[in-house]
């Protein structure tokens, strides 16, 4: 059997970092065998069978010159094989990343936070960290490890299924190459890192009648699980065409009517989503999806961009409990839906 | 000869915008984690934000999340801190540093100095 | 975010006198902590990495101990050149932090 432990990488490569001392190891010979070690096409003779080295040859301080492939040849001048050198960096700890779309899944993706120049690869786990005792606030790694999938195609991701919402995982990211492994430890709460994908099917909609409505609605992102004790709530904004400002409100369910819309312009709306008891953090925004108040009786005089202008809008009436407001700053409730006078916001 | 060399200091008024760039040369940029620490006048050291050597994961701190952007461009050997919605408390010096791995600095930059004043 | 704390927070010693800065950190971090020098305008400069490795080039009277949570910084014969700030950092967690800082003068 050959004297040489053969490294993680492709068979007959031998690894070293520069500017350190590297020993390369002659594969077809018994340990000790004294060898002449020469480079690949060329004549002169390296280390000699003398050297009192054996099967190995040393070279000091070795630099990217003394990359390439090597022969070692036994004292009868039979060949013992031929090594190739590569030169690169022991693995740095990576850097990892973990996402929840939902509430019972995650994903972790990782970087290398050095390049080594060497063949590297991933090992991926996690274990279940659980609370000591009943008001402690130790926790310890109770239960696993067990290994996160990688995904198949070589992205450099992998999931954990069927996590439960209320445990802390500690992930194990270790990158691994032939010059050694290094390994990121990251603590993982879900409640923390939950980030729900954005709303789907965001349609708007003029209200006939009516030249200051427009009808947002939408769908739960495909990817949230349905089930009743999750549910997410919502951010929207709006805007007429050009203006730079949105408007923001926090919609009751899974539809919104504008009331102050600005009457013949065409309005930009976007939709986010967030779990509703505050965990994890806002989605992406929403594609923006675009409608246009329906025609109605405009007022006779628009003032300038930069006012706020109130009038009646032509419409049936229905008792109004409240005085209207504009929603041209971001507030947690629309104007009532009843408002029988509604506000033409013109915006800056 | 091995160094990083900040650009794009200067003074901007808060709510401002402004863009750092380092330029790094002598080593081989693209291996390597590269970050951004600053320092107000007569304080400490603040970590600012870090970028993987191949930019597909980047960090920062709280105090600027949202606000800023760390980028990298290999081919050009220089990184870059887009600095918006800026606050009288981001005047500081802006250092670039290069690693080795991720949050250890063994090359820095002369530093650019940002002021944030009206 | 992991505090890391320094003391003292300043020193004067005598020229050859032996110095030693120690940090704190608010948990535990293995051995992930570097010590740098900040001359007065100049950009900060490693000395010690991963709590007791000597950077490359850095002169030998300067040493580093510690792990978990407590950390000492040596400098065995303070030099005149040695007037500087010293900070400990972490880099246990991928949101370094750096201490306060400990002002070193001679006396």
């Known amino acids: 059997s050959s004297p040489c432990p053969q490294a993680w990488g492709p068979p007959g490569v031998q690894y070293g970092q520069p500017g350190r001392s590297v020993k390369l190891c002659c594969p077809g010979v018994t340990a000790g065998d004294p060898v002449s070690w020469f480079r690949d096409g060329e004549p002169k003779l390296l280390q000699g069978p003398d050297s009192g080295l054996g099967h190995e040859l040393v070279l000091a301080q070795a630099d990217s010159t003394d990359e390439g492939t090597y022969i070692c040849q036994t004292l009868d001048g039979a060949l013992g094989g031929t090594v190739t050198l590569q030169l690169g960096y022991p693995p740095a700890r990576p850097v990892v990343s973990c996402q929840a779309a939902d509430y019972e899944n995650f994903s972790c993706t990782w970087s290398p936070s050095q390049i080594s120049g060497l063949p590297t690869r991933y090992l991926t786990s996690y274990r279940k960290k659980t609370v000591l005792g009943a008001d402690s606030q130790r926790r310890s790694p109770s239960t696993g490890p067990w290994p996160c999938p990688q995904d198949p195609l070589g992205a450099a991701r992998c999931v954990v299924h069927g996590a439960e919402f209320w445990s802390q995982y500690r992930i194990n990211v270790t990158e691994v190459n032939p010059l050694g492994a290094s390994t990121r430890l990251l603590d993982v709460s879900l409640q923390s890192i939950l980030r729900p994908d954005p709303p789907q099917g965001l349609r708007v909609e003029s209200v006939p009648g009516y030249p200051r409505r427009l009808r947002a609605s939408w769908t739960y992102p495909a990817s949230w699980p349905c089930q009743p004790h999750f549910l997410l709530k919502f951010r929207l904004q709006y805007r007429p065409a050009q203006h730079p400002a949105w408007s923001t409100v926090e919609p009751a369910g899974l539809e919104e009517v504008i009331t102050d819309a600005v009457a013949g312009l065409p309005h930009a709306v976007r939709v986010s989503a967030r779990d509703f008891l505050d965990a994890g953090t806002w989605s992406t925004w929403s594609p923006e999806a675009w409608g246009t108040p329906s025609t109605g009786t405009i007022p006779k005089e628009i003032p300038a961009w930069g006012q706020l202008h109130t009038q009646p809008e032509v419409e049936p009436q229905v008792d109004s409990p409240a005085p209207p407001r504009p929603s041209l700053q971001p507030h947690p409730r629309l104007l009532d839906h009843r408002d029988s006078v509604e506000q033409v916001a013109v915006l800056a | 000869e091995v160094q990083l060399l900040e650009s794009g200091g200067g003074l901007v008024q808060p709510g401002g915008s402004l863009r750092l760039s380092c330029a790094a040369s002598g080593f081989t940029f693209s291996w390597y984690s590269m970050t951004w620490v600053r320092q107000a006048p007569g304080k400490g050291l603040e970590w600012v934000s870090s970028i993987v050597p191949y930019g597909d994961l980047t960090q920062y701190a709280e105090s600027v999340k949202g606000r800023f952007t760390i980028s990298r461009d290999n081919s050009k050997n220089t990184l870059y801190l887009q600095m918006n919605s800026l606050r009288a408390e981001d005047t500081a010096v802006y250092y670039c540093?290069?690693?080795?791995?991720?949050?250890?600095?063994?090359?820095w930059g002369r530093g650019t100095l940002v002021t944030v004043s009206s | 975010d992991i505090q890391m704390t320094q003391s003292p927070s300043s020193l004067s010693a005598s020229v050859g006198d032996r110095v030693t800065i120690t940090c704190q950190a608010s948990q535990d971090i293995n051995n992930y902590l570097n010590w740098y020098q900040q001359k007065p305008g100049k950009a900060p400069k490693l000395l010690i990495y991963d709590a007791s490795n000597l950077q490359t080039g850095v002169p030998s009277r300067f040493s580093g101990s510690g792990s978990g949570t407590d950390f000492t910084f040596t400098i065995s014969s303070l030099q005149p050149e040695d007037i500087a700030t010293y900070y400990c950092q972490q880099h246990e967690s991928q949101s370094p932090t750096f201490g306060p800082g400990t002002k070193v003068d001679i006396k």
């Open positions: 540093a290069k690693g080795p791995g991720w949050g250890s600095f063994d090359l």
